[in-house]
């Protein structure tokens, strides 16, 4: 699985990585002005896990299972 993955939050992450086989999802989440793009585990694609892991109380997130599916426009849909 390929995901956009930036180590630190950035407004427009364009770094694509081949996620290791442990990861079966891509995540994009926005918390205030911070946007996170990550390789992720689908079992952790829920509000509680995302907020705990990002240490953010309020956010919107989108998980997906296709290559490079975690781009900004997904959060606007």
């Amino acid at each position: 699985l390929q995901c956009y993955n930036c180590p630190n939050p950035t407004a427009d992450c364009k770094t694509a990585v081949n996620c290791s086989s442990d990861f079966d999802a891509c995540l994009i989440t926005k918390a205030g002005l911070q946007v996170y793009n990550k390789c992720w585990k689908f079992e952790h694609c829920n509000f509680n896990d995302v907020t705990t892991r990002l240490r953010e109380n309020e956010l919107t997130y989108y998980c997906c299972k296709k290559d490079l599916c975690n781009f900004n426009e997904q959060l606007e849909n």
Epitope: P7, S20, D49
Partner: antibody, heavy 121, light 107 residues
Framework: EVQLLESGGGLVQPGGSLRLSCAAS????????MSWVRQAPGKGLEWVSY????????HYPDTVKGRFTISRDNSKNTLYLQMNSLRAEDTAVYYC??????????????WGQGTSVTVSS | DIQMTQSPSSLSASVGDRVTITCRAS??????LAWYQQKPGKAPKLLIY???TLAEGVPSRFSGSGSGTDFTLTISSLQPEDFATYYC?????????FGQGTKLEIK
């Protein structure tokens, strides 16, 4: 304050079994992945197992696969490592560690003090 | 499995020195690299993750750099409490592997 307290180590004969426990406090245990890492005397660090927050996924290196089993009881805030068919090369200090620092999988930010396991006849 | 190779295995330096430790991965791990410090008889302590991001409470004299396969940990001005063993670890995916360690000793 985050605390991880391992127990269950000791002396065991080759081929024997041991169950390590790690009691967690000071954080939402059920929301964090956990790992066990060991260190043989005078040697470096070796990761031995991982379990996701809900227990849905586990990972092991080939050196312990089929012999060690990681599990957790989120109602008791406790992590376990069941070690079977122990070998001399399993002799080490075993640390439990909290995993998932700032949304990064497999980064361990808090560690216990360790429990010592000796496998010898 | 991804192999992590550190160099040097040991290093002697003095307080105030600038020290660099290197870590090489056997394949591309992007920026999925962490550094830990361990003192004798103690548990490891997380210093850096994502190759260059300092963990909470870590002094700014520590810095990390690199991506892909080659990484460095730099201590800009050694303090007495920095003499310890340092390990790199990739966090790209399982199985996790550590470097063999670099023991930093007082000259």
């Amino acid at each position: 304050e985050v605390q991880l307290l391992e127990s269950g180590g000791g002396l065991v004969q080759p081929g024997g079994s041991l169950r390590l426990s790690c009691a967690a406090s000071g954080f939402a245990f059920s929301s964090y992945d956990m790992s066990w890492v060991r260190q043989a005397p005078g040697k470096g660090l070796e990761w031995v197992s991982y379990i996701s927050s809900g227990g849905g996924s586990t990972h092991y290196p080939d050196t312990v696969k089929g012999r060690f089993t990681i599990s957790r009881d989120n109602s008791k805030n406790t992590l376990y490592l069941q070690m079977n068919s122990l070998r001399a090369e399993d002799t080490a200090v075993y640390y439990c560690a909290r995993d998932g620092y700032y949304a990064e999988y497999y980064v361990m930010d808090y560690w216990g003090q360790g429990t010592s396991v000796t496998v010898s006849s | 499995d991804i192999q992590m190779t550190q160099s040097p295995s040991s290093l002697s330096a003095s307080v105030g020195d600038r020290v660099t430790i290197t870590c090489r991965a056997s394949e591309n791990i992007y920026s999925y690299l962490a550094w830990y410090q361990q003192k004798p008889g103690k548990a490891p302590k997380l210093l850096i993750y994502n190759a260059k991001t300092l963990a909470e409470g870590v002094p700014s004299r520590f810095s990390g750099s690199g991506s892909g396969t080659d990484f460095t940990l730099t201590i800009s001005s050694l303090q007495p409490e920095d003499f310890a063993t340092y390990y790199c670890q990739h966090h790209y995916g399982s199985p996790l592997t550590f470097g063999q360690g670099t023991k930093l000793e007082i000259k």
